[in-house]
């Protein structure tokens, strides 16, 4: 009976995600058969989040909208380890929008999910950010410094990275 009700709950949770994510890849968390964590196929997973590299070229606003219709946000990078994971799936000759912007052009950077902007956990290329008209952040590769962040005009189309919490069923 307990297993039956658990299965029913799982099915109803899966139905919620079905519209945008017809297929999920799930792994068993720990030793308990009851706990499964899932990411939409073909998203990648790291710690408690799922990531998707969007290869369509869009402005920052539309990139965020694209993520949101999938139940995600543009990526918020919280640690060096997270960035190191993300860059494994990026192409060196492309740039990708992050969920970081400075809407007022006053160097008050903010993350899309309201995570406080912490200057100590930022990975700007040297000399960046450098322009008040460039109010959105990208991650890109520079041969001298490898992967880092740069500010760019928000209307210039770029690829992007979406991030969502893992789905627990």
């Amino acid at each position: 009976n307990f297993m039956y009700s658990k299965t029913v709950k799982r099915l109803s949770k899966l139905r919620e995600y079905q519209q945008y994510h017809p297929s999920l890849t799930c792994v068993m968390e720990g030793k308990d058969i009851e706990d499964w964590s899932c990411c939409p196929t073909p998203w990648t997973s790291f710690q408690s989040s799922c990531y998707f590299i969007s290869t369509g070229m869009q402005s920052w606003t539309k990139s965020q909208k694209n993520c949101s219709v999938m139940g995600a946000d543009l990526v918020v990078i919280n640690t060096r380890e997270e960035q190191d994971f993300i860059i494994q799936n990026l192409k060196r000759n492309s740039s990708y929008f992050l969920g970081l912007s400075d809407p007022g052009g006053r160097r008050h950077w903010q993350w899309v999910d309201q995570t406080p902007y912490n200057e100590n956990v930022t990975f700007w290329h040297s000399g960046e950010p450098n322009n008040l008209d460039e109010r959105c952040a990208i991650i890109n590769f520079r041969s001298s410094e490898e992967w880092g962040w740069n500010d760019i005009h928000c209307h210039v189309p770029q690829k992007s990275i979406c991030k969502m919490k893992k789905i627990y069923i």
């Epitope: 070229m57 869009q58 909208k65």
Partner: antibody, heavy 118, light 107 residues
Framework: QVQLVQSGAEVKKPGASVKVSCKAS????????IHWVRQAPGQGLEWMGT????????SYNQKFKGRVTMTRDTSTSTVYMELSSLRSEDTAVYYC???????????WGQGTLVTVSS | DIQMTQSPSSLSASVGDRVTITCRAS??????LAWYQQKPGKAPKLLLY???TLAEGVPSRFSGSGSGTDYTLTISSLQPEDFATYYC?????????FGGGTKVEIK
Amino acid sequence: QVQLVQSGAEVKKPGASVKVSCKASGYTFTSYIIHWVRQAPGQGLEWMGTIYPGGGDTSYNQKFKGRVTMTRDTSTSTVYMELSSLRSEDTAVYYCARMGDNEYFDYWGQGTLVTVSS
Amino acid sequence: DIQMTQSPSSLSASVGDRVTITCRASGNIHNYLAWYQQKPGKAPKLLLYDAETLAEGVPSRFSGSGSGTDYTLTISSLQPEDFATYYCQHFWSTPYTFGGGTKVEIK
């Protein structure tokens, strides 16, 4: 007032290159991105790509990749669109357009007719 | 790439008529759609953006509606200066493709 003034008509031979200019005035040049759109005679409109005058960042329509180059000169508030390896199908009016804050083309240049003929 | 299919390609109408032009996208463009008016020898002029927002200085007889993949431009009462070609354009992702155009002619 905002104005985009383009260079004059050009006649080119197949295989040659053409460089069209678009001089902006009436606003802060580096604050708005510029797009290029073309229109073949009696035909519809085709988006070619965009350039950000501040940093020089570009994004091109894959159809033209390798043949189109967009550049800018901030000292004269001018953007340029160069199209190489011209063929007769490139005969068209080429427009520059400014993308406004609402992310749509709010101001257009008057157009530059490029004729490719042997 | 998202394709934009506009219909009809041409129509004949009289002054005072109500005119409707439709634009269908090959994918969801989330209302990121503009409508332009173009007269011979001139650059296109922005009429509406975000599918239904009137651009500055555009008469209120022009209106837009739609969502997802299907959008409409309506001219409630056609005026002599409205005889022109109309184009839709999406701004969801590059390339920002245009519809094929609708030529509105005098009946």
